[in-house]
Interface confidence: medium
């Protein structure tokens, strides 16, 4: 059984990093009864989804940049 069938997590695996120019938006899901881990789900400009590693320094920078751009808009 995969991780997805054990808990209601959406991220089975994570990408270590992705170029920010390919990302349209980022959603950070906090742990809860549905999933014990923090999940970072990026919506790419091509409409697809990708899970990012929340512990990755690159991903942290991407999240920070996205949140800052949201605040300034």
């Amino acid at each position: 059984a995969s991780v997805a069938t054990e808990l209601r997590c959406q991220c089975l695996q994570t990408l270590q990093g992705i170029h920010p120019k390919n990302i349209q938006s980022v959603n950070v899901k906090s742990p809860g009864p549905h999933c014990a881990q923090t999940e970072v789900i990026a919506t790419l400009k091509n409409g697809r989804k990708a899970c990012l590693n929340p512990a990755s320094p690159i991903v942290k920078k991407i999240i920070e940049k996205m949140l800052n751009s949201d605040k300034s808009n």
Epitope: A1, S2, A4, T5, E6, L7, R8, C9, Q10, C11, L12, Q13, T14, L15, N27, K29, G32, P33, H34, I41, T43, R48, K49, A50, C51
Partner: antibody, heavy 125, light 107 residues
Framework: EVQLLESGGGLVQPGGSLRLSCAAS????????MSWVRQAPGKGLEWVSA????????YYADSVKGRFTISRDNSKNTLYLQMNSLRAEDTAVYYC??????????????????WGQGTPVTVSS | DIQMTQSPSSLSASVGDRVTITCRAS??????LHWYQQKPGKAPKLLIY???NLESGVPSRFSGSGSGTDFTLTINSLQPEDFATYYC?????????FGQGTKLEIK
């Protein structure tokens, strides 16, 4: 053909018990989460409970917590809902639903993409 | 728990019309939202998954949009078989919750 077939519904007195079954066919049952959803007469849909593919994780609506137990037997491709201490407000058609996830690279989601025909449960004295 | 509120609760329209049903979540759910269609005496049927993706076999006149808290289901050029009740459902977190439904009736 992917199919879900519920059974076990019927008339029961308040405080009584009932066990619903849902027989699955046409897909690898053990790989997918399953849910029970109910619909009271003339009302909308209410999620009742869900269970992970292995049966190791279970989830319940507050309205049934402590009274209902969801389980599955992957060797029999069957989902169960044990309903105890039944109340009049539990009267509904009960549906089982497969939570068929779609997998993109590094991403999974859950949607109730296959449903059974429903089994009616009436709680009345 | 996340509350889902649909509007309108009922809607009258004619064949060929374009109709829009809205669903609002009590907190942000990203795009973790599905739309279902249910006809009387039948089980629900998945129409749209993850807010905007058409389920296999569903006619292209159905479309979904939205993210965060506000979502819409649009049916272009209503067909006789589209008169039914429509529900939104969030899966962002448990407990899973449905909207109260929108009944689409023939005018």
């Amino acid at each position: 053909e992917v199919q879900l077939l519920e059974s076990g519904g019927g008339l029961v007195q308040p405080g009584g018990s009932l066990r619903l079954s849902c027989a699955a066919s046409g897909f690898t049952f053990s790989e997918l989460s399953m849910s029970w959803v109910r619909q009271a007469p003339g009302k909308g849909l209410e999620w009742v409970s869900a269970i992970s593919g292995s049966g190791g994780s279970t989830y319940y609506a507050d309205s049934v917590k402590g009274r209902f137990t969801i389980s599955r037997d992957n060797s029999k491709n069957t989902l169960y809902l044990q309903m105890n201490s039944l109340r009049a407000e539990d009267t509904a058609v009960y549906y089982c639903a497969r939570e068929g996830g779609r997998l993109e690279p590094y991403y999974y989601y859950y949607a109730m993409d296959v449903w059974g025909q429903g089994t009616p449960v009436t709680v009345s004295s | 728990d996340i509350q889902m509120t649909q509007s309108p609760s009922s809607l009258s329209a004619s064949v060929g019309d374009r109709v829009t049903i809205t669903c609002r979540a009590s907190q942000s759910i990203s795009d973790n939202l599905h739309w279902y269609q249910q006809k009387p005496g039948k089980a629900p049927k998945l129409l749209i998954y993850d807010a905007s993706n058409l389920e296999s076999g569903v006619p292209s006149r159905f479309s979904g949009s939205g993210s965060g808290t506000d979502f819409t289901l649009t049916i272009n050029s209503l067909q006789p078989e589209d008169f039914a009740t429509y529900y939104c459902q969030q899966y962002y977190s448990t407990p899973l919750t449905f909207g109260q439904g929108t009944k689409l009736e023939i005018k």
